[in-house]
Amino acid sequence: EVEKTACPSGKKAREIDESLIFYKKWELEACVDAALLATQMDRVNAIPFTYEQLDVLKHKLDELYPQGYPESVIQHLGYLFLKMSPEDIRKWNVTSLETLKALLEVNKGHEMSPQVATLIDRFVKGRGQLDKDTLDTLTAFYPGYLCSLSPEELSSVPPSSIWAVRPQDLDTCDPRQLDVLYPKARLAFQNMNGSEYFVKIQSFLGGAPTEDLKALSQQNVSMDLATFMKLRTDAVLPLTVAEVQKLLGPHVEGLKAEERHRPVRDWILRQRQDDLDTLGLGLQGGIPNGYLVLDLSMQEALS
């Protein structure tokens, strides 16, 4: 019987081809040269290797490149990428967007794995910032990618990249993230006219301050209730009834259905009941007529 560490006669691989799918693990180990594998990595993905056979091929590459694979190999990993651990990936230096796309394609249709998260982290850190092309690519594969970043990480997104962001990319963002993204969006879209500007900025308004909402109320934007409900409570509270009416336009009627939810509930509590009554929606809970409203925050500032 042939010793398992020696390649059987006539089985030495001259190239990476389909004949290897019949090789047992020990035969692959003994008969496939790691350097040959590295130079012909582009063929591996076209050959239906089993899960176990891919383990052997990975092991051979690990031995050849203990400090991490070169990008020429990484770009052609294909399904072998799914065998990589985050620790393996941390050794890589991935600079090409094409390489990133090739590896994301392998995981397409699946949730972001720890391997993919590590790959993206390595790539973005290597580039120094999240440029438009990268953001375009990442959000195409993972619409929720942007909202998975911390506010600190989002601060490295240049305003020009905001053009790549689609409304659905922001669905899972929290207020802290929108606080960072909104000023960038405002800068990115500043040269657009009123109605076009509102269409683009709408998804980011969860980070807008009061003064910007007041400005929008003067532009007949007809904000829908879904967008209004995502606004920062502290930004909505100072708005007058007239400003909210102008901001929402025909959608103002929707306030009644939302009167028990923030920020509408808190906003109602700050308005004079007289003013709320002018909307004719039956909103209740405003400040009764004849009551004096003291702004305690202002009083504290003066003392």
């Epitope: 239906p48 290797f49 799914l82």
Partner: nanobody, 121 residues
Framework: EVQLVESGGGLVQPGGSLRLSCAAS????????MGWFRQAPGKGRELVAY????????YYPDSVEGRFTISRDNAKRMVYLQMNSLRAEDTAVYYC??????????????WGQGTQVTVSS
């Protein structure tokens, strides 16, 4: 444990087509490569189509290349074999099998019971 059940076999005229299906139950097949084998009377089992665990790559021997197509749907736990331009020599019992090791017939973990395909005028 995985159970494989083939269907779709039958009698077909030369030049005709058949589509075989293989339904898996039990454990997930997502990490298994899948193969279709055939065995004609008095002959050994012959691999006619083979597909990787993620479905991205396939293998066919020269005897069926260009005529047979293997595909899989991991979500539905199904594997298919589309057979076109059938010839008399394609007559055999066709088996579906799952392997995590190699494409070698001896290395398959699970086999179906087989479905008869007869090509005759």
């Amino acid at each position: 444990e995985v159970q494989l059940v083939e269907s779709g076999g039958g009698l077909v005229q030369p030049g005709g087509s058949l589509r075989l299906s293989c339904a898996a139950s039990g454990n997930t097949l997502s990490r298994y490569n899948m193969g279709w084998f055939r065995q004609a009377p008095g002959k050994g089992r012959e691999l006619v189509a083979y597909i990787s665990w993620r479905g991205g790559s396939t293998y066919y021997p020269d005897s069926v290349e260009g005529r047979f197509t293997i595909s899989r749907d991991n979500a539905k736990r199904m594997v298919y074999l589309q057979m076109n331009s059938l010839r008399a020599e394609d007559t055999a019992v066709y088996y579906c099998a799952a392997s995590i090791k190699t494409a070698d017939p001896d290395d398959y973990d699970y086999w179906g019971q087989g479905t008869q395909v007869t090509v005759s005028s």
